[in-house]
């Protein structure tokens, strides 16, 4: 196996006019606490300007290997696949990965166009079009809309639902040809069933010999992955396996594994 | 330890209406996604509707403009609120919910599901 991603003592600052941005967002936010009592922690990592939003994360991911990604919110997730990106420049330390890569973000976005023209964007592949229409549950959906996947979205076409729109942005995200697929929690809108579905089918064995990033909170897919990252107010708090994971030190562990 | 416990069905006819309420109860620190699905006898259990935390909601179309879903997170409870009832919606209901436990860290979740309750809508 060849390394496909390595960050190593990456530490980020957001820009100070993502900083004021962020800032100016949260203020806006800061009495709207969630209705379970819990304090909103909306951009809570741009809480002070000049706070890193990333400090000394080091991972390494081989070829064809799944990393998933967890954490509270604010915790750097989102910034994380950011700077994988490109989108944020590390102050310290350094990234590497080999080429292309494919994003799925956490609210989906439709283009105006056909149901295909969303998905695959220029080039034409029939069967990996079939089978990512598959894995990603959306062939009955297809068969149900009247010009099946030439039903036009967007302005004047129909309207998704939001289970339907977040498994379209998957789909395109998937039928992408890239090195590495970064998924930043896509199964927010799915119902459990499908989510199910789709983590096995599409993340799990469509997948299966692409490296992907997967943010996700859910026990389950922390199981499946080959290596986990948790990350805690923009520290790596713990990396490594799910075995190793459950072999930390009792007390956590037990919280961990409930 | 958490539970989730459905309540609301009942025998109904045709064109009538129910609520069924779901709470969830034990250390629970916080809770995502919450949903509706239901199973018929001898068929697969499916998506009925899906709320997330900030409210968002999605249905199955086989009930879009009848049922509306709706949740209390101070009383971490989802509700479905069932209108023009159809024979074909008779099934067992079950309440899911994406939980984050009081003694789970960064807020990692497991999925919780109710013991079902019956909808009966005869003609």
């Known amino acids: 196996t060849t390394t496909e991603v390595v960050m190593e003592n990456v530490t980020a600052f957001w820009e100070e006019g993502f900083g004021e941005l962020f800032e100016k967002a949260k203020q806006n936010n800061n009495n709207r606490k969630t209705s379970n009592g819990d304090d909103s922690l909306f951009f809570s990592n741009f809480s002070l300007l000049g706070t890193p939003v990333l400090k000394d994360i080091n991972f390494k991911i081989e070829r064809g290997q799944l990393l998933a990604v967890a954490g509270s919110t604010g915790a750097g997730k989102t910034s994380l696949l950011m700077m994988i990106m490109g989108e944020l420049e590390p102050s310290e330390g350094k990234i590497k990965h080999s080429g292309r890569i494919s994003f799925c973000p956490q609210f989906s976005w439709i283009m105006p166009g056909t149901i295909k023209e969303n998905i695959i964007g220029v080039s034409y592949d029939e069967y990996r079009y079939r089978s990512v229409i598959k894995a990603c549950q959306l062939e009955e959906d297809i068969s149900k809309f009247p010009e099946k996947d030439n039903t036009v979205l967007g302005e004047g076409g129909i309207t998704l639902s939001g289970g339907q729109r977040a498994r379209i942005s998957l789909a395109r995200a998937v039928y992408k040809d890239a090195d590495l697929y970064l998924l930043d929690s896509p199964f927010g809108y799915l119902d459990v069933l499908t989510e199910k579905e789709i983590f096995e089918s599409c993340v799990c064995k469509l997948m299966a010999n692409k490296t992907r990033i997967l943010v996700t909170s859910k026990m389950e897919h922390l199981k499946k992955a080959d290596k986990i990252l948790i990350l805690h107010e923009g520290s790596s708090y713990f990396y490594g396996t799910f075995s190793e994971l459950q072999n930390l030190q009792p007390d956590f562990s037990s919280k961990l594994m409930g | 330890q958490v539970q989730l416990q459905e309540s609301g069905g009942g025998l109904v006819q045709a064109g009538s209406s129910l609520r069924l309420a779901c709470a969830a109860t034990?250390?629970?620190?916080?809770?995502?996604?919450m949903g509706w699905y239901r199973q018929a006898p001898g068929k697969q259990r499916g998506m009925v509707a899906i709320?997330?935390?900030?409210?968002?909601?999605d249905y199955a179309d086989s009930v879009k403009g009848r049922f509306t879903i709706s949740r209390d997170n101070a009383k971490n409870t989802v509700y479905l609120q069932m209108n023009s009832l159809k024979p074909e919606d008779t099934a067992t209901y079950y309440c899911?919910?994406?939980?984050?436990?009081?003694?789970?860290?960064?807020?990692?979740?497991?999925?919780?599901w109710g013991q079902g309750t019956q909808v009966t809508v005869s003609s």
């Open positions: 899911h919910a994406e939980i984050t436990e009081q003694s789970r860290p960064f807020y990692l979740t497991d999925d919780y």
């Open positions: 034990g250390s629970i620190r916080s809770i995502n996604n």
């Open positions: 709320i997330t935390r900030v409210g968002n909601t």
